[in-house]
Every structure is written in structure tokens, then in C-alpha cells.
């Protein structure tokens, strides 16, 4: 007769682990006991359990409650066993020795792999800034055994770097994401993937990018100058910018204060009925947490009964 | 051959502990089995406990938690702690060796001793 038994047994972590141990025997041959033990290099066979073909299950107060036979119906050549619930300490060797009339005994050994899932876990890096050089966007770290694989999904354009750090049982898998961030990086997604062969599917988490910035500051309204003329009414400006955070506005005269009657809404500056006092120069002052900008414009009041031209002077400063 | 001799039995109350002992001699093989059963008078013999030679255990569901079987096998020795006693486990206590024997397996016995609970 002989044994047969897997040379691998893969379990995941929590899950009833089958040890199997089936005695191929000539007819008339009978398996008088099957005893389990764990058998790793270094130390001594510690008994698992004992099956005896008289005395039913036995196990060892090590594994009380843990080692179970499989359901029936039960083959009395079958000596395999579960091993419920498996931790990380259950992986090593293992060996079925069957003890048989009149053949005597046989020995098998396999090896239980314990598959210990990640649970990773992404931290974003710096607030990122553009005009920044390369910087961390996000680190994601998984520890499993065996070791998890770490990559990432993004379109973004970015360098990676990985480290791990082995432990007695698991390993530790870091993954860096580095940019060079911009504007145009706002609000798009960046996901870690850490796939693992404990895992039905590869686990994602999904981080989305903020980059702060500030553009340009422009104003708009003064495109057509014949416009801007005495007693012309709803005359307004208009401060043009982005950013991240959302920018505030804020309008000031630089050559005094706002007129009276001029009203300041936001980004917007509406006029009441034009006169020849609201010509001056106004400054609209943008920023948000990262920066601040300039724009500012000459507005110059036409007086239809003069036949002197409107002059225009735009300045944006940073 | 094997010969069982058992020691410890007596008078107890309930509630009380008890030892038993059995030493083993003979022909001893590598792959035996040790237990204990016992019989109440009237009544058919029952499993208490058993034991491998590596340390797992079987017992009866009636004396799960109060009583624990071990071995020394270097002294060929099997005992019996019996705890929390109860007038129910009144019986005599026998010492069982299994050995392989031929097709299958040889239960040696011992001659008994006597475990009385009462108050």
C-alpha cells in the first residue's frame, strides 16, 4: 500500500484547513490509527491529534476544539483531518503516519502555507503646491504573507518607489508615488493596488489629488472703450483667476477710494450711472492660502461732448 | 502479555478529587493506547478517557471539564484526576491498554478499582 497525501496544503488565515492522509492499501489491509504531528526543522514531532480506528478522534490539548474529522461519510482508509480555523503559527510541517494491518507503517509529510490577506493603508503625502520640484503625492503601505505586491493606478504622471521589510511571518510592502505637481493634476484620482494570492481581488484605494495654485489675474470690461463714457449705466469689471483653494477677490482705487455707489460683489465691480470721478485706477487683489495676485486697470471716463478718445492702460502684476 | 494494576480508588465526597493510577508492564508496544472505563453497578462498562502516546485525549462527554487523563510514558504510568465528584460517577474504575494485535487492536485490562461518592 502507500499513502497519499498534497505536498501543499494553501489555506487563508481564518479558514478550516483539510489535512489530507489517504491510505491506498491492498484488499484485506485496515488502518489501525493515523496519527498527526507537527513536525518543523529544529524541533521536536509535537502530536496534532490521533485517529484511532477503535477509540475514535483523539487531539492533543494543544489543538482542543481545533482538530475535527471531516463530515461523513468517512472512508476507514482515510486518515485526513481539519484543522479549523488557521493562524499565521498553524503554517509548517506536517506529517501522517499511518500504522496499518498487517502492513505496518507509513509515513507522508505536507507542508500548510497560511495566507495572511493585507489591509493596506494609503497616506497622502505633503500638501502638494505647484511650482513644486518632485514630491510625495502618497505612500501605501500592506503587510501580508506572503509578501503583498504593491503598484499603482493613476494617470498621472509620476515616479515610484517600493521598499519591504521582512518580519518573522509576514512582510511589509511600501509604495512611494512622487509628481511634480500641476494645476491640471487637480481632482484626478491616484489609486493603490495591492494584490496578494489570499485576496479574490486586488484591493484599491483611491486618494484624489489637490494641487494649489494661483493663475494669472486679469480684468475684463474695458474691452470696448467708446463704451465707458458719461451716464452710461451697469458698467461693471470683472476679475478673471483660478486657484486651489478657490480664490477671494478683493477691488481697490490706487489713486483714492472706491467711489460712492460703486458696489463690490465678489469678483465683480458694477459701477452706477458713469461720471468723470470713477476714472481712475482700479487694483483687483486675488489669493488663496497659496499665493496672491494683481491686476489693475485705468479707467478713463469719456465726456461725449469732448472729442478726445478713452485711453486704456492694462497692467497685471504678480 | 501486559499486565494493568490500578491504585487510588476509595471513599469520597461529593464534590471531592480523586487519583487513580495504573501502572503498565509487558510487552509495551510504540503505537498503544491507554484509557480508563468503568461500571456502575447494573450497568454496562463505559469509556471515561483515553490517551495517545503523544499527549491527545478522548473523553465522555459526561466528565468533560471535571476529570483529565495523562501519562508518563517513561514510567509506563496512566492516571486518572478525577474533580467536582458526583454520586453518579460511583463505579468501578478499570485501566485499558490497547495494543496491536495481529488484524487489529488487543484491549489488556486491569483488575479494577473501586471509586465510591457519597456523603
Known amino acids: 500500500g502507500e499513502l497519499e497525501t498534497s505536498d501543499v496544503v494553501t489555506v487563508v488565515l481564518g479558514q478550516d484547513a483539510k489535512l489530507p492522509c489517504f491510505y491506498r492499501g491492498d484488499s484485506g489491509e485496515q488502518v489501525g490509527q493515523v496519527a498527526w504531528a507537527r513536525v518543523d526543522a529544529g524541533e521536536g514531532a509535537q502530536e496534532l491529534a490521533l485517529l484511532h480506528s477503535k477509540y475514535g478522534l483523539h487531539v492533543s490539548p494543544a489543538y482542543e476544539g481545533r482538530v475535527e474529522q471531516p463530515p461523513p461519510p468517512r472512508n476507514p482508509l482515510d486518515g485526513s483531518v481539519l484543522l479549523r480555523n488557521a493562524v499565521q503559527a498553524d503554517e509548517g510541517e506536517y506529517e501522517c503516519r499511518v500504522s496499518t494491518f498487517p502492513a505496518g507503517s507509513f509515513q507522508a509529510r505536507l507542508r500548510l502555507r497560511v495566507l495572511v490577506p493585507p489591509l493596506p493603508s494609503l497616506n497622502p503625502g505633503p500638501a502638494l503646491e505647484e511650482g513644486q520640484g518632485l514630491t510625495l503625492a502618497a505612500s501605501c503601505t500592506a503587510e501580508g504573507s506572503p509578501a503583498p505586491s504593491v503598484t499603482w493606478d493613476t494617470e498621472v504622471k509620476g515616479t515610484t518607489s517600493s521598499r519591504s521589510f521582512k518580519h518573522s511571518r509576514s512582510a511589509a510592502v511600501t509604495s512611494e508615488f512622487h509628481l511634480v505637481p500641476s494645476r491640471s493634476m487637480n481632482g484626478q484620482p491616484l489609486t493603490c493596488v495591492v494584490s496578494h494570492p489570499g485576496l479574490l481581488q486586488d484591493q484599491r484605494i483611491t486618494h484624489i489629488l489637490h494641487v494649489s495654485f494661483l493663475a494669472e489675474a486679469s480684468v475684463r470690461g474695458l474691452e470696448d472703450q467708446n463704451l465707458w463714457h458719461i451716464g452710461r449705466e451697469g458698467a461693471m469689471l470683472k476679475c478673471l483667476s483660478e486657484g486651489q483653494p478657490p480664490p477671494s477677490y478683493n477691488w481697490t482705487r490706487l489713486d483714492g477710494p472706491l467711489p460712492s455707489g460703486v458696489r463690490v460683489d465678489g469678483d465683480t465691480l458694477g459701477f452706477p450711472p458713469l461720471t468723470t470721478e470713477h476714472s481712475g485706477i482700479y487694483v483687483c487683489h486675488v489669493s488663496n492660502e497659496f499665493s496672491s495676485r494683481d491686476s489693475q486697470v485705468t479707467v478713463d471716463v469719456l465726456d461725449p461732448q469732448e472729442d478726445s478718445g478713452k485711453q486704456v492702460d492694462l497692467v497685471s502684476a504678480s | 502479555e501486559v499486565q494493568l494494576v490500578e491504585s487510588g480508588g476509595g471513599l469520597v465526597q461529593p464534590g471531592g478529587s480523586l487519583r487513580l493510577s495504573c501502572a503498565a508492564s509487558?510487552?509495551?508496544?510504540?503505537?498503544?493506547?491507554m484509557g480508563w472505563h468503568r461500571q456502575a453497578p447494573g450497568k454496562q462498562r463505559e469509556l471515561v478517557a483515553t490517551?495517545?502516546?503523544?499527549?491527545?485525549?478522548n473523553y465522555a462527554d459526561s466528565v468533560k471539564g471535571r476529570f483529565t487523563i495523562s501519562r508518563d510514558n517513561g514510567k509506563n504510568t496512566l492516571y486518572l484526576q478525577m474533580n467536582s465528584l458526583r454520586a453518579e460517577d460511583t463505579a468501578a474504575y478499570y485501566c485499558?491498554?490497547?495494543?496491536?494485535?495481529?488484524?487489529?487492536?488487543?484491549?489488556?485490562w486491569g483488575q479494577g478499582t473501586q471509586v465510591t461518592v457519597s456523603s
Open positions: 490517551i495517545t502516546r503523544g499527549g491527545s485525549t
Open positions: 485499558v491498554d490497547v495494543e496491536p494485535s495481529g488484524m487489529g487492536w488487543r484491549d489488556y
Open positions: 509487558g510487552s509495551i508496544s510504540s503505537i498503544n493506547l
